[in-house]
């Protein structure tokens, strides 16, 4: 560093835990959504909801920020005819995505709020409410039954009545579907013309019950029962139905594939192709066979369009195809062999001829990179728009490809926005314009572009307040490096203090996630407790996407099948060894942290020995760790370890109990909320039993009655402080030890 740089750095503040929760660091997402060829709705920082017309460059206020504030509304949604707004308030979270809340309707712009209720109850807390695709049609879900309202002011009618609270879910996910399969609480889908509604009926009656305790607030603790299928236990059953909304509400089930491999199945994707045809992906319980069908909503007959099989497991089963107007042609993502690195995810087009039962299938993209999302299909211009990792696995750039002729590709976002390499995007209905959302590495921003020439028309949001805060702070320096293991090049991200010099000794913190298919090394903007560790406490943080991670081919992804932990440990340890070769790393201060699956890995890795058979890690921490996959969700565990009950060796081998007996003097902090609905406290209880048996050293921090996702920001703040304090203390103890050892050496002399 030159003295001048040094000076300016010393004027800058360090990032603190308070910063993580301050308005200065809060990224504003305008949540812009196209509603026509030229218009989108978005929300300003001050809360006002506006409609912007990109052709006339004018905007109209739809809802005043003050109105949203006065209603204490958390969410808003505008009706398709732009006449009404739907607000939810007093929202109570259930699981990761689901919540209950009160809903009101209000005429735009200044109408009085009117409550949305089922006919039989007033002031009801609903599980869901939302507009349909046309006019003012809306549905809501109450007590797992679906109600339909043709327009505001008309009485709602109950169109699905088979719901049973906590047992039979109509149009909503149960715990497993919300968390592991659909990854949303919404399990209903409108036909594009609004005449039909497809909905999932999920039956949990045979799924075993888990009870979550509540210790506080009453003299005797209470329990909240819910159906949670652990590995090998009875799963929810699901069926897909379509109801007609014009005239008598006729309900028809879509027929699952008649295939012996599909005796037990999941529905992982539903998307309307036309107003009478609905695409459905059916996945067998073992998650190694999937069938994409096109179902006729008038007869319930589903025709197979594509089948996928894997020797390991099928990844990315939620992705929706994109259809031509007539539904005859559709684009979908599938894994295609690309040589030595296995399969990569690419766009395939399937076209059916009017008088033929055979579909013509062609690949639009190819190469050793992944298409991460199909965004839009321009039928007139014969172009498909998508995001991919072609630039680098840690990036997401926006591309277009021709859908006829030579399938030529063009990058639309490359070098388009300064300090931005990780994008998401959405297109206007005519495809003439697009919203480009930059997610990093710089401060996130949203810009509006013309598709023809990519030209930026204007900035919708630049988050200047965050840019200013970042410029005033000692932000970590980010470096990327690859490490080579067994023919793989594994990406590594290193965060160094802003004041870094290679003559200083820094403690090292390895942060692991490693859920199969995930990615830790990405060029996304993030300010987290890890930033605080680097900026305020001079740690070097390292992350590595080892075997089992995503976006680097299925060969690397599937390596971990039936042996979770084994190869991830090797790869993470190689990342640590690589760092320990650097003279600026203090080998006596090395730590590891992970949460959820990362908590499993951090616990698994903590006892690992170094090259000289000494311990590598000084300390480690796990937040809500999975410790035994037979205690975890069926869909997750069975995907990677096979069906529990058939061959349990993989389950036995992956238990962390076998590892923790090797824990020596390392400090180990386990943190677990007691009402964790995803990774039950039972995991930690089992782990601690083993730790005690092995006479290991551990500390346990619980959050009484808190759920997995820590929805309260004061608790989140407490959690981050606890983790930071643990590592700061761990790194400080070593200072003391070094001093003591040095003194002892002097005395001996």
């Amino acid at each position: 560093l030159t003295p001048a740089e040094d000076n300016s750095l010393s004027q800058k503040k360090k990032v603190t835990v308070e910063d993580l929760f301050s308005e200065d660091f809060k990224i504003h997402d305008p949540e812009a959504k196209w509603i026509s060829d030229t218009e989108f709705i978005y929300r300003e920082q001050k809360g006002t909801v506006r409609l912007w017309n990109v052709e006339t460059n004018t905007s109209t206020v739809l809802i005043e920020g003050k109105k949203i504030e006065s209603l204490r509304a958390i969410r808003y949604e505008i009706s398709p005819d732009r006449e009404y707004a739907l607000f939810s308030y007093n929202v109570e979270p259930i699981y990761q995505h689901s919540y209950t809340g009160y809903y009101v309707l209000s005429k735009i712009p200044h109408g009085d709020p009117q409550s949305l209720d089922p006919p039989e109850v007033s002031n009801a807390k609903l599980q869901y409410a939302g507009w349909g695709p046309k006019g003012q049609q809306l549905i809501f879900i109450f007590e797992n039954n679906i109600y339909y309202c043709a327009h505001v002011g008309k009485q709602a009618i109950r169109v699905v009545s088979t719901g049973k609270e906590g047992v039979i879910y109509n149009g909503l996910s149960d715990w497993l579907y919300e968390e592991e399969i659909l990854k949303t609480h919404i399990a209903h889908w409108w036909s594009p013309d609004g005449t039909r509604l497809a909905y999932a009926a999920i039956n949990d009656s045979r799924v075993p019950i888990m009870e979550l305790p509540t210790y506080t607030g009453s003299i005797y603790p209470t329990v909240k029962p819910y159906h949670y299928p652990k590995a090998g236990s009875e799963n929810p059953s699901i069926s897909l139905h379509v109801i007609g909304l014009n005239g008598p509400t006729h309900d028809l089930e879509m027929m699952p594939p008649d295939d012996p491999r599909m005796r037990e199945y999941y529905i992982t994707m539903v998307k309307w192709a036309t107003s009478t045809k609905v695409a459905v992906t059916w996945l067998n319980r073992a998650q190694n066979v999937s069938i994409l069908t096109l179902c006729d909503a008038t007869t319930g007959v589903c025709t197979k369009k594509h089948e996928d099989e894997s020797e390991a497991w099928l990844h990315r089963q939620n992705e929706e195809p994109v259809f031509s107007k007539d539904g005859r042609k559709f684009f979908f993502i599938r894994a295609i062999p690309q040589g030595g690195r296995g399969k990569f995810y690419h766009i395939t087009v399937s076209s059916s001829q009017p008088n033929s039962s055979n579909d013509n299938i062609q690949s639009i993209t190819s190469g050793d990179w992944d298409v991460t999302k199909i965004l839009a299909y321009d039928e007139k211009g014969n172009k498909i728009y998508f995001l991919s990792t072609e630039d680098l696995p840690r990036r997401r750039q926006l591309y277009s490809a021709n859908t006829v002729g030579n399938f030529n590709r063009q990058c639309l976002s490359c070098d388009l926005v300064e300090n931005c390499t990780y994008f998401s995007a959405s297109f206007s209905h005519s495809m003439d314009f697009f919203l480009l959302k930059c997610e990093g590495p710089g401060v996130p921003m949203v810009t509006v572009h013309n598709t023809t020439d990519k030209k930026k028309m204007f900035d919708l949001e630049t988050n200047e307040h965050v840019k200013k805060a970042i410029n005033d702070r000692q932000m970590p320096k980010v470096e990327y490096r690859d490490i080579e293991i067994d023919d793989y090049n594994l990406p590594m991200q290193i965060l160094k203090p802003a004041t870094f010099t290679d003559t200083t000794h820094y403690p090292l913190l390895l942060v692991v996630d490693g859920t199969p298919g995930s990615q830790s090394v990405a060029e996304k903007f993030e300010v987290s407790w890890e930033t605080v560790m680097v900026s305020s406490h001079g740690a070097v943080v390292v992350k590595c996407d080892g075997r089992g991670s995503g976006f680097q081919g299925t060969k690397l992804l599937h390596e971990v099948r039936r042996r979770l932990g084994l190869l991830e440990e090797k790869d993470q340890m190689e990342a640590v060894r690589t760092m320990l070769k650097e003279q600026y790393i203090d080998r006596t201060r090395v730590a590891v942290f992970g949460k959820d699956y990362g908590g499993y890995l951090s616990t698994y890795i903590l006892p690992a020995k170094g090259e000289n058979q000494g311990q590598t890690f000084t300390c480690g921490s796990a937040l809500s760790p999975i410790t035994d996959f037979k205690l975890y969700a069926s869909a997750f565990s069975e995907r990677y370890l096979g069906l529990h009950g058939l061959d349990n060796r993989a389950y036995e081998m992956t238990k962390v109990a076998h590892r923790v007996s090797a824990l020596e003097e390392q400090q180990f902090l386990i943190i677990h909320p007691t009402a964790d609905e995803k990774i039950h406290f039972q995991h930690t209880a089992e782990l601690i039993t083993q730790l005690i048996r092995g006479k290991a050293n551990y500390s346990l921090q619980i959050y009484p009655d808190e759920s997995h996702y820590f929805t309260s920001s004061s608790l989140k703040q407490h959690l981050y402080r606890s983790i930071i304090n643990f590592f700061v203390e761990c790194f400080r103890i070593q200072d003391k030890l070094l001093t003591v050892t040095a003194k002892e050496d002097e005395e001996e002399d």
Epitope: H250, D251, L252, E253, G300, V301
Partner: nanobody, 123 residues
Framework: QVQLQESGGGSVQAGGSLRLSCAVS????????MGWFRQVPGKEREGVAA????????YYADSVKGRFTISQDNTKNTVYLQMNSLKPEDTAMYYC????????????????WGQGTQVTVSS
Amino acid sequence: QVQLQESGGGSVQAGGSLRLSCAVSGSSYSRFRMGWFRQVPGKEREGVAAIYRSDGRTYYADSVKGRFTISQDNTKNTVYLQMNSLKPEDTAMYYCAAGAYSSYLMDANFAYWGQGTQVTVSS
């Protein structure tokens, strides 16, 4: 692909009985709705009786209630229509149909149809 094959039709005097059979092949799907329909030339097809394969629930048109009985033998993958006290107005081509599970047992939205079997009732 589901195939349906009707049999058992024929000629009978008024007041007599017939038993129609419908053999279902090509599918192991258990949640079918099975239906019997009939059609007189020049008239619309009309629903006679229906049954759910999974739970055995049944439906009958008013004109045949108490006289006709729909039943199934899941081991043989066959659905039957027992017709008693036949009347001349029961004369028609009888079709077996299979469809997806639905909240309405009887509607025309059956996906699969047999070729039909003729029933003639003379006075």
